[in-house]
């Protein structure tokens, strides 16, 4: 996260951070608790890393530095990534995970809420981004779990800050015209959140941006509400029932 | 399957036209930034142009400045390029090509993805 | 403009033996945006390497890149008898994009 500060124990139970354990151990990107068993993250982050038993998922955890072998952390037992997605281009970057077991929620692990699906009437304008990511382009992951307040962008400004991408509907934007604050590397997966009517929605999975806090250059994440069929077909079909924390 | 046909090459005149085309299956066409590349005889790939998804936005290289259009109907799933006051030096297989633009570690990623199979343009008198 | 020169202009290897081809760019370039093609006469490029190091679809594991900054190889750990064309390397940092001059990796 560029341009944001520390977060607090229980601001954002719902961030997780998936790590890679091959030789050494790593933050990749983040994620968001979205039922007991599910985490829901961008479909990118597994590109040339497919394998479920390298990943280590660490839900209830603001500091990376505080975690030591013996920190639990939950392992995959599947890796649902959208039928749609191609490793050639931006859209459908959101894929489910299956936790091997449960979590138990606590007050520093649990989960966000999802919007109703096809949420185009919503305003919002609290809306934030959190994340380990770096904290400039050419950074490093951060130890302190960072927040930042950025406003959503209509998609027709966002295609003209990205004329040689295409933004489609499923894609919503957040910037600062200046830049200064954005998501960045090590963000990717996790969660652009808004708070509307006291209750804190899932509205976007952070995906893509050029570079990091530039002027004009907002950053992209993958619209929820648009994928709600595909949320709920996937964790239905794979629990019997539903265990989503939808909107009250 | 992916697939890029481009035709229209041939053989023209100095300061002749030509109009090639490069029809697209197997993607959604309209959601990609297609270029073009040539590769005159015995030599290596030079890039010519490309133009984003929409058509709106176009760039060239300095050698074809001004004398080359690069265009495209996403109705049509059709990439053309529209070369005028062509010169002996643009003698070249052209080729089409698929931009792939991947996410990696939250950038974009930028790469020719598909390639057409060519077309031979000939500039001679 | 960026530059990209490679080396050697050719390679003469045996099948089974390792090829390492450099591509120096004259200025930096985001490895996103560094790519590796193979041609082999008369056909189009074929995409090997894309983001500096990651495989294309299809491409076997002894294809290999790496690299930053200014500094990219493409390692083929293992010649194969097809493995035997011209090698690329291209950028799109920053327009105009360029390619390299050319590898040729010939039959020893």
């Known amino acids: 996260i560029v341009g944001g500060t520390n977060s607090s124990w229980g601001e954002w139970p719902w961030q997780v951070s998936l790590q890679v354990k091959l030789t050494a151990q790593r933050h990749l990107c983040g994620g968001s608790l979205i039922g007991h068993q599910w985490v829901l993250t961008a479909a990118h982050c597994f590109d040339g890393l497919p394998l479920q038993d390298v990943w280590r998922i660490y839900s209830g955890i603001l500091n990376l530095s505080d975690i030591t072998k013996d920190t639990p952390f939950s392992q995959i037992k599947e890796i649902i990534i959208h039928q749609n997605y191609k490793v050639s281009e931006g859209n459908h970057d959101i894929a489910l995970i299956k936790l091997q077991a449960p979590l138990n929620y606590t007050e520093f692990q649990k989960p966000i809420c999802l919007p109703s699906k096809g949420d185009t009437s919503t305003i919002y304008t609290n809306c934030w981004v959190t994340g380990w990511g770096f904290s400039k382009e050419k950074g490093e992951i951060q130890n302190i779990l960072q927040k930042v307040n950025i406003p959503l962008v209509t998609n027709e400004e966002c295609q003209k800050r990205y004329q040689d991408y295409k933004i489609t509907q499923r894609m919503v934007c957040a910037g600062y015209k200046e830049g200064g604050k954005d998501a960045c590397k090590g963000d990717s997966g996790g969660p652009l959140v808004c708070k509307h009517n006291g209750m804190w929605r899932l509205v976007g999975i952070t995906s893509w941006g050029e570079g990091c806090a530039r002027r004009e250059q907002p950053g992209v994440y993958t619209k929820v509400a648009e994928y709600m069929d595909w949320i709920l077909e996937k964790t239905q079909s794979s629990d019997g029932k539903a265990q989503m924390q939808s909107p009250a | 399957e992916v697939q890029l046909l481009e035709s229209g090459g041939g053989l023209v005149q100095p300061g002749g036209s030509l109009r090639l085309s490069c029809a697209a299956s197997g993607f959604t066409f309209s959601h990609y930034l297609m270029t073009w590349v040539r590769q005159a005889p015995g030599k290596g790939l030079e890039w010519v142009s490309y133009?984003?998804?929409?058509?709106?936005?176009?760039i060239y290289a300095d050698s074809v400045k001004g004398r080359f259009t690069i265009s495209r109907d996403n109705s049509k799933n059709t990439l053309y390029l529209q070369m005028n006051s062509l010169r002996a030096e643009d003698t070249a297989v052209y080729y089409c090509?698929?931009?792939?633009?991947?996410?990696?570690?939250?950038?974009?990623?930028?790469?020719?993805?598909?390639w057409g199979q060519g077309t031979l343009v000939t500039v001679s008198s | 403009e960026i530059v990209l020169t490679q080396s050697p202009g050719t390679l003469s290897l045996s099948p089974g033996e390792r090829a390492t081809l450099s591509c120096r760019t004259s200025?930096?370039?985001?490895?996103?945006?560094l790519a590796w093609y193979q041609q082999k006469p008369g056909q189009a490029p074929r995409l090997l390497i894309y983001?500096?190091?990651s495989r294309a679809t299809g491409i076997p594991d002894r294809f290999s890149g790496s690299g930053s900054g200014t500094d990219f190889t493409l390692t083929i750990s293992r010649l194969e008898p097809e493995d035997f064309a011209v090698y690329y390397c291209q950028q799109s940092s920053r327009t105009p994009w360029t390619f390299g001059q050319g590898t040729k990796v010939e039959i020893k």
């Open positions: 983001g500096a190091s």
């Open positions: 133009i984003s998804p929409s058509g709106g936005h176009t």
């Open positions: 200025q930096f370039v985001n490895s996103n945006y």
């Open positions: 090509a698929m931009v792939g633009q991947g996410i990696r570690g939250r950038s974009r990623t930028s790469y020719f993805a598909q």
